[in-house]
């Protein structure tokens, strides 16, 4: 009889453990933000991209905040940050201002408490995109593991924003918490 009770108790404890694990997982912060194609800046200079979707298509956010073009951390922790930026040009959409391009992405962390800004990751290349080629494409993917504090903000800067590929599977960035800070 006592064995049976112990087994039942273990099962109940186990299910509570699962539930606790699951609720903790559900509370784990994550975000996947996709470019808002209706509001991409023009030009060739380095700009901050402020228009991102957080709740449509592939875009989702949980226990993080998106505000004023920045992804805001709500929980201290170690996070994996990633960004994928695609640049493209087809001759039917116009001419290139220059055939020599620097196509770059910068993932930046801004701290409000101690006003400071740091580039966490950058990627890209200089490219020769001949005006005689009908189509050009280039993709950058960066990712890394960072300690982030509540209130810190993540933003994306790119060069040549007018060449951004506006598809949700092309230009996006995100973050997910991997573990707590000990």
């Amino acid at each position: 009889g006592s064995q049976h009770i112990r087994a039942e108790k273990a099962m109940v404890d186990g299910s509570w453990l699962d539930l606790a694990k699951r609720s903790k997982l559900e509370a784990q912060p994550f975000a996947h933000l996709t470019i808002n194609a209706t509001d991409i800046p023009s030009g060739s200079h380095k700009v901050s991209l402020s228009s991102w979707y957080h709740d449509r298509g592939w875009a989702k956010i949980s226990n993080m905040t998106f505000s004023n073009g920045k992804l805001i951390v709500n929980q201290d922790g170690f996070y994996y940050l990633y960004a994928n930026i695609c640049f493209r040009h087809h001759e039917t959409s116009g001419d290139l201002a220059t055939e020599y391009l620097q196509l770059m992405v910068y993932v930046t962390k801004t701290s409000i408490k101690i006003p400071s800004s740091h580039t966490l990751m950058k990627g890209g290349s200089t490219k020769y995109w001949s005006g005689n080629s009908e189509f050009h494409f280039y993709s950058i993917n960066v990712g890394g593991f960072f300690k982030l504090r509540s209130g810190e903000e993540i933003s994306i800067e790119v060069s040549n924003p007018s060449l951004l590929d506006p598809d949700q599977d092309a230009t996006y960035f995100g973050a997910f918490k991997v573990r707590d800070i000990d």
Epitope: S44, E91, G94, D95, A97, N132
Partner: antibody, heavy 118, light 111 residues
């Protein structure tokens, strides 16, 4: 539809300068090179140079490099071509033009006749 | 600079017959698998109008009587059959490299 409207005919003295205008409409002015081509009875069609209106990048053919300045005003979608130190051989019809969505010059202004005469 | 030589300088063709105009470039105008040669028609007092782009592509609204062919340095504009309205001067142009250049023109007269 794409339209390029040029300024009126000019009669100028040798040694003087002329500044022609070309107002673009029907497309995003800052996304295409705007070209200048002239046509003289003796030389036929000659490509002079071009401007990319956004950043203002320019390119000129060697023959005109020292005498031509191409500019653009993005607020009015207007391009300008100034030709200095005019001589009689510069008497010509001057066209502004833009390529088509593929290639080739699909859009032309109506042309501006410049006559250089004392 | 790439020099474009058109021939003949003028030709007279009977109504309904074929007109052939040649354009030879001093060096290849091909790159990225395409030929950067275009053909224009110009009537007196008018700007040129684009007929053929990238050697063989018919510009929108241009009658199928007009066709272009060729690659690298040798290109041809063909009008078949010729109509009375085709009396004009025809120019080839390359934009493979700066400065863009034009041929000297071919004046077509209809007999």
């Amino acid at each position: 539809q794409v339209q390029l409207v040029q300024s009126g005919a000019e009669l100028v003295q040798p040694g003087a300068s002329v500044k022609l205008s070309c107002k673009a409409s029907g497309y995003t002015f800052t996304t295409y090179w705007l070209q200048w081509v002239r046509q003289t009875p003796g030389q036929g069609l000659e490509w002079m140079g071009a401007i990319y209106p956004g950043p203002g990048n320019t390119k000129y053919t060697q023959k005109f490099k020292d005498r031509v300045t191409i500019t653009a005003d993005t607020s009015t979608s207007t391009a300008y071509m100034q030709l200095n130190s005019l001589r009689s051989e510069d008497s010509a019809v001057y066209y502004c033009a833009r390529r088509g969505s593929r290639r080739g010059i699909a859009y032309w202004g109506q042309g501006t006749l410049v006559t250089v005469s004392a | 600079n790439i020099v474009l030589t058109q021939s003949p300088a003028s030709l007279a063709v009977s109504l309904g017959q074929r007109a052939t105009i040649s354009c030879r470039a001093s060096e290849s105008v091909d790159s990225y698998g395409r030929s950067f040669m275009h053909w224009y028609q110009q009537r007196p007092g008018q700007p040129p109008t684009l007929l053929i782009y990238l050697a063989s592509n018919l510009e929108s609204g241009v009658p199928v009587r007009f066709s272009g062919s060729g690659s690298r340095t040798d290109f041809t504009l063909t009008i078949d059959p010729v109509e009375a309205d085709d009396a004009a001067t025809y120019y080839c142009q390359q934009d493979n490299e700066d400065p863009y250049t034009f041929g000297g023109g071919t004046k077509l007269e209809i007999k």
